[in-house]
Interface confidence: low
Amino acid sequence: QVWSSGVFELKLQEFVNKKGLLGNRNCCRGGAGPPPCACRTFFRVCLKHYQASVSPEPPCTYGSAVTPVLGVDSFSLPDGGGADSAFSNPIRFPFGFTWPGTFSLIIEALHTDSPDDLATENPERLISRLATQRHLTVGEEWSQDLHSSGRTDLKYSYRFVCDEHYYGEGCSVFCRPRDDAFGHFTCGERGEKVCNPGWKGPYCTEPICLPGCDEQHGFCDKPGECKCRVGWQGRYCDECIRYPGCLHGTCQQPWQCNCQEGWGGLFCNQDLNYCTHHKPCKNGATCTNTGQGSYTCSCRPGYTGATCELGIDECDPSPCKNGGSCTDLENSYSCTCPPGFYGKICELSAM
């Protein structure tokens, strides 16, 4: 298969040989008659680079074509080529290079005695010759021309169209839509890649992450995703992951554990304000934070224990002498003395 960027198309539409004569005014010998001079007509086409003065001689630098016999004297040609499968109308000249925008065209109408002999060069067979040069931009529109000489008319049209997947003024821009690992795009009017929704980059291979996905800490494999890099979390990968076990702390960067006010230690799990949060001291004792989750209680008179939870019994052991009975008072005691004894602890005898 010929690789090409575009194709020059020539559509032969109508040929009129008013008198059925050759270019040298002779009758077409061996013609199809009647009339006696009917010309079996075929065409030779030569497409070449632009020449200010067109030379009909080879080489046909852009290509050449010879048609079968298409009609006798005057005839119209349908699109597609009609009954003869060997001829397709328009005639196509594939290009494997950038279309230059100019060309020269030679179309010769010739007569043949035998439909099997179209190759033999014989100037006496020439009915008419058209030689022209044109500027032509790429496009779908057909340009139409009518070439008239004294006895013949040739109506034809031509255009240059890009092959599928080729774009631009010279059909030199290649763009084939795709939707795979190598690109997710369609093609614009000038062959530019138009990324499918959710994709970006020169080849539309970079997925557009979920809007808001942190550019530094998030990424995605397909559109709308937001996958987090190590140490980050959250829908937009904008939340750092704290040090494992971090309890009352925050982070600005991964694996940090910056303690909130009132907390300390590696995991921010040690209460620096134990007194306020837990009120451990009982019975009106005074609590003092001593750091790292510890504290001390200063007991009021009459109380003891780590949290001043124990009341001191002043009667244990009893200080009362001589069988006196003891009554516990706050931070004190009193002795009830038996008859004959008195004093703070019944230590004195009345005798």
Partner: antibody
Amino acid sequence: EVQLVESGGGLVQPGGSLRLSCAASGFTFTSYDIHWVRQAPGKGLEWVGGISPADGDTDYANSVKGRFTISADTSKNTAYLQMNSLRAEDTAVYYCARNDYDVRFVGSGMDYWGQGTLVTVSS
Amino acid sequence: DIQMTQSPSSLSASVGDRVTITCRASQDVSTAVAWYQQKPGKAPKLLIYSASFLYSGVPSRFSGSGSGTDFTLTISSLQPEDFATYYCQQSFTAPPTFGQGTKVEIK
């Protein structure tokens, strides 16, 4: 921890005004849109409007356009819904919710919502 | 405004059932659709965004599909905590609009 807390709801007479607040914490306030969504008793969800705190750009539902105004104070990380000319049909629980920029882009949804505040319009 | 029409409006199902809720947009909304779950007296919770992406922390029994105008929320095996009302929401064109809701009840 991301949090949105609405306040300011209550009972108001038809034609009256009320201002709801939505206090945001735990995220960069200017990196998201804040939307107000309401739900009338026993009914479905209805979008009221939204704001991009970064540039103050707002959009409203046709049903509240001209009566409600959304604003944001980035220094306080708070969005507001000023409701004027209130009608009985405005009675609803009002939620604020956060959403990434350009709600029209990819259908990314409203991922955090406040607890809601009840507005009752009645005489 | 774009209308989002959910069906059915309510359904009864048993634990372990496969449940499918559909949402039809009145015009093409690409894949700009989110699904929410709401329980009585609570705020909605995001389940699915961009039509088919499972939101962080949502159980994998929930899935979403569709693009253009037709969208589906599927619960592969209904759990007791899944009995709630579900809403779809488009955010392709302003204003964002919600479906009317589908209530999933215990059979």
